[in-house]
C-alpha cells in the first residue's frame, strides 16, 4: 500500500509568492511559492495519485504583514481552501497568546491541529479541550493512518503560551500516544511536529512504532541529487534514521517559507511496516502556475494590507537616526530603538531567579536602511518601518559563548571607518573600542547586563559563559562576515518578523524618544569618525 505525503513547514505567512530568497516578490516571472501556486501542485498530485495527505509541521504564524493584520485568520482561511489534512502546532502559533491561537485558528480550522506534548492545566484545560488533539486517525482510501503531533518544548522561551500550558519532553509524551494508536490497530504512524531536525531524528530513533517523521522549526533543507535552487542540502531526502529497535525510519523537512512542497512516497506492507521511501522537495517556481481562484482570493484579502501600512502605529518626538553615516560608525538612536524593541519582544518571566531569560541584543548597522524624520507630526507607519528594515528578516534567539561574542565585537571594528555594515548596534551591552590598537584587539571593555539578578546591572563578559542574545537572522547565518556566530552558535531559534517586532514596540510605547546614551564608546585618546 502506497502513501504520498505532501508537507510544508515554517511557512511564516508567505501567502503571496516571494522572491527566491523568500522576501517580497519583485519580478513575478522569477517568483516562487505562495498558496495559489502550492494549490496548483497539490491538486495536480491529488488527481494523479490515490492516497495523498497534505500535512503542515507548524509555524504558519508570523513573518509578514499578512499575520500582523489578519492575526491567524488568513492561515485558517487559506489552509482550509487548500484542504490540509492535519497540522502540528509550532512555537510561533503562540505569538499572540493562547487566545490568538484559539479564536482565529483552532476554532476555524477544518482540519485537525495536533500536539501530544502540550498539556493544558487550570482554567484553560476545559476552555481548550478538543480544540487541539494529541493524535488523529486519518482515513486514507481503505486504510487508516495515525498522525501524532509534537511541539518544541522551548516554546515558553520563544513565544507567549502563558502559564496554563505545560510543554513536556517530546519523546516521553509521544510514546504513550503511539502505543494507544497501536492498541486501536492503527499500524501506520506518522510523527508530525515542530522541534527541529535534531529532535526529529531522536524521535525516529527512540519512539517505538513511529514509521515516518515529518518535521519543522530548523528550516532544514534535504535533497537527493542536484538541488534546484540556492538552498544547500543538510542531507538526503528522506534522511534515514535507524531506530533503536532496528527499523529504517525516514525523516523529512521541507526548508521554509512555502518555497518547496515536500513530496515523500512511502510503501507499507500489510502489517504497516515501511518497505521503501523516496521523494524530494518540489521547488514551487514560476513553471507552476498560480491557481486563479486562490489568487483572486489572495488579491481580495490583500486590500486590507495596503490600508494598514499607511496607518499611524505611534509617534516619535525625536529624529530616528538610521543614517549609514551614524549607524555604521557609532551608536545611533535607531539602533538603540530596534534593540530595545527586540529585548522587549523577548520578555518571558519563566524563572523566579531571572528577571528575564535574555538581556542582550546585537544588530549590524548595515541592516538599518533609513532614518525616520520626526517632523512629519511624529507619525510612524508600517511603511516607514519597512524602509528602515526592508529585507523581511527575523530577530532570532541564539546561545553563544562569551568568547564568540568577543570575536564578534572585534569583527565589528576590524576595518572601522570604511562605512561597512558589520559595525554593531547593541542593547544590554556596553562596549568600549580603542581604534589605535590593531584589528582583532580593539575591544578594551565589554560589559553585559545580568539576567540572574533582581536589579539588572552590567558585569564584565566571561569568555566561557554561555549567553543568550537576540540578533537578526542575517547575523545568525554568518552575514556581514560574522562567520564566528554561524560556526560557534550553540543554539538558534527563529524569531519574529523584524518590522513586526519594532511596530509592536512602538504601538505599545505610543510615544518614543530613543537617545544615544553611551552603549558604544571609543577610548578617549582616539578621535573617531
Amino acid at each position: 500500500w502506497e502513501l504520498t505525503i505532501l508537507h510544508t513547514n515554517d511557512v511564516h505567512s508567505r501567502l503571496e509568492q516571494t522572491s527566491e530568497d523568500s522576501s517580497k516578490c519583485v519580478n513575478a516571472s522569477r517568483c516562487m511559492g505562495g498558496v495559489a501556486r502550492l494549490f496548483t501542485k497539490v491538486q495536480q498530485i491529488r488527481r494523479a495519485e490515490p492516497n495523498v495527505l497534505l500535512l503542515d509541521a507548524g509555524d504558519q504564524y508570523q513573518g509578514t504583514i499578512w499575520f500582523t493584520v489578519y492575526k491567524g485568520a488568513e492561515v485558517a482561511h487559506f489552509m482550509n481552501a487548500l484542504r490540509y489534512d492535519a497540522m502540528a502546532l509550532g512555537n510561533h502559533e503562540f505569538d499572540n497568546g493562547v487566545e490568538g491561537l484559539i479564536e482565529p485558528l483552532l476554532k476555524e480550522a477544518k482540519f485537525p491541529i495536533l500536539s501530544a506534548n502540550i498539556k493544558a492545566k487550570g482554567p484553560l484545560a476545559s476552555q481548550i479541550s478538543g480544540l487541539y488533539l494529541p493524535y488523529k486517525v486519518l482515513p486514507v482510501g481503505d486504510e487508516v493512518v495515525g498522525i501524532v503531533g509534537y511541539t518544541s518544548k522551548e516554546t515558553p522561551f520563544l513565544s507567549n503560551p502563558g502559564t496554563n500550558l505545560v510543554f513536556e519532553d517530546e519523546i516521553t509524551a509521544l510514546q504513550p500516544e503511539v502505543d494507544k494508536l497501536k492498541t486501536l490497530n492503527v499500524n501506520k504512524i506518522i510523527a508530525l511536529g515542530h522541534s527541529g531536525f535534531e529532535m526529529d531524528k531522536l524521535i525516529a530513533q527512540k519512539v517505538r512504532g513511529v514509521d515516518v517523521v515529518v518535521g519543522g522549526h530548523s528550516n532544514t533543507f534535504l535533497y537527493t541529487g542536484n538541488p534546484p535552487s540556492k538552498e544547500v542540502p543538510a542531507g538526503k531526502y528522506p534522511f534515514i534514521v535507524t531506530s533503536d529497535d532496528g527499523r529504517k525510519v525516514p525523516v523529512v523537512q521541507a526548508y521554509a517559507f512555502g518555497k518547496y512542497l515536500g513530496y515523500l512516497k512511502i510503501e507499507f506492507d500489510e502489517r504497516g511496516n515501511v518497505i521503501s521511501s523516496h521523494g524530494n522537495p518540489i521547488l514551487l517556481n514560476s513553471s507552476i502556475p498560480e491557481d486563479p481562484s486562490i489568487k483572486a482570493d489572495i488579491n481580495k484579502w490583500r486590500i486590507k494590507l495596503d490600508n494598514y501600512s499607511t496607518q499611524e502605529l505611534g509617534k516619535t518626538i525625536v529624529y530616528l537616526d538610521g543614517s549609514s553615516q551614524s549607524c555604521r560608525f557609532r551608536e545611533c538612536n535607531m539602533g538603540n530603538l530596534i534593540c530595545d524593541a527586540m529585548i522587549n519582544n523577548n520578555l518571558r518571566h519563566t524563572d523566579e531567579m531571572f528577571w528575564n531569560h535574555v538581556s542582550m541584543c546585537i544588530l549590524n548597522g548595515g541592516g538599518i536602511r533609513s532614518p525616520i524624520d520626526e517632523r512629519n507630526n511624529g507619525t510612524i507607519t508600517w511603511e516607514n518601518l519597512a524602509a528602515v528594515l526592508p529585507f523581511g528578516g527575523t530577530f532570532d534567539l541564539v546561545q553563544l559563548k562569551g568568547s564568540t561574542l568577543k570575536k564578534a565585537f572585534e569583527h565589528s571594528v576590524h576595518r572601522y571607518g570604511q562605512s561597512t555594515g558589520e559595525f554593531l548596534q547593541v542593547g544590554g551591552i556596553h562596549v568600549v573600542y580603542d581604534l589605535s590598537r590593531k584589528p582583532g584587539d580593539r575591544v578594551v571593555k565589554l560589559d553585559v547586563l545580568c539576567t540572574k539578578c533582581r536589579v539588572p546591572s552590567y558585569d564584565p563578559l566571561k569568555m566561557d559563559e554561555v549567553y543568550k542574545v537576540i540578533l537578526p537572522n542575517f547575523l545568525a547565518n554568518g552575514g556581514d562576515g560574522f562567520q564566528m556566530i554561524k560556526d560557534e552558535l550553540l543554539r538558534h531559534d527563529s524569531g519574529d518578523q523584524d518590522i513586526n517586532v519594532v511596530s509592536t514596540y512602538i504601538s505599545k510605547m505610543k510615544v518614543i524618544y530613543p537617545a544615544v546614551e553611551g552603549r558604544i564608546k571609543f577610548s578617549h585618546h582616539h578621535h573617531h569618525h
Epitope: 482550509n80 476554532k107 482540519f111 478538543g130 488523529k136 486519518l138 482515513p139
Partner: nanobody
Framework: QVQLVESGGGLVQAGGSLRLSCAAS????????MGWFRQAPGKERAFVAA????????KYGDSVKGRFTISIDNAKNTLYLQMNSLKPEDTAVYYC???????????????????WGQGTQVTVSS
Amino acid sequence: QVQLVESGGGLVQAGGSLRLSCAASGRTFSGSTMGWFRQAPGKERAFVAAIRWIGGTAKYGDSVKGRFTISIDNAKNTLYLQMNSLKPEDTAVYYCAATAGGPDYLGGRDIVYDYWGQGTQVTVSS
C-alpha cells in the same frame, strides 16, 4: 470547549418514530463528518449513519437503511437522526460523533471520529 450534546431519546413503541438531536459547539464543524453510533447492552458500538457537514452526502448502516434519515441544520449547528419504523432491536444508547476535519470521510470506523457526545437512551418496546 468542543461539545456534542444529544437529546431526544426515550421510550417508544415498535413501529413508532423518534428524532434525536445533537447540538455541536466550540469550533467549526464545516469540515467535519458527523455520525451516529449506537451501543446495545452487551454489544459493540455500531455505526448507524454519517453525513458530511458541507454538501450533506450521507451513508447508512445496513440495518437502518430506508428507516433512518440523518440531516444537519447548519444555522443551528445541529445534527439530527430521524428514526421511523422503530424495532425492538433498535434499543441502544445512541451517540453523536464528529471528526475534527481532515480527509473527506463517510464511514463507520469509530476511531476516525474525534468528538463524542455522552449518549441518549432509546428504548423500543414490543
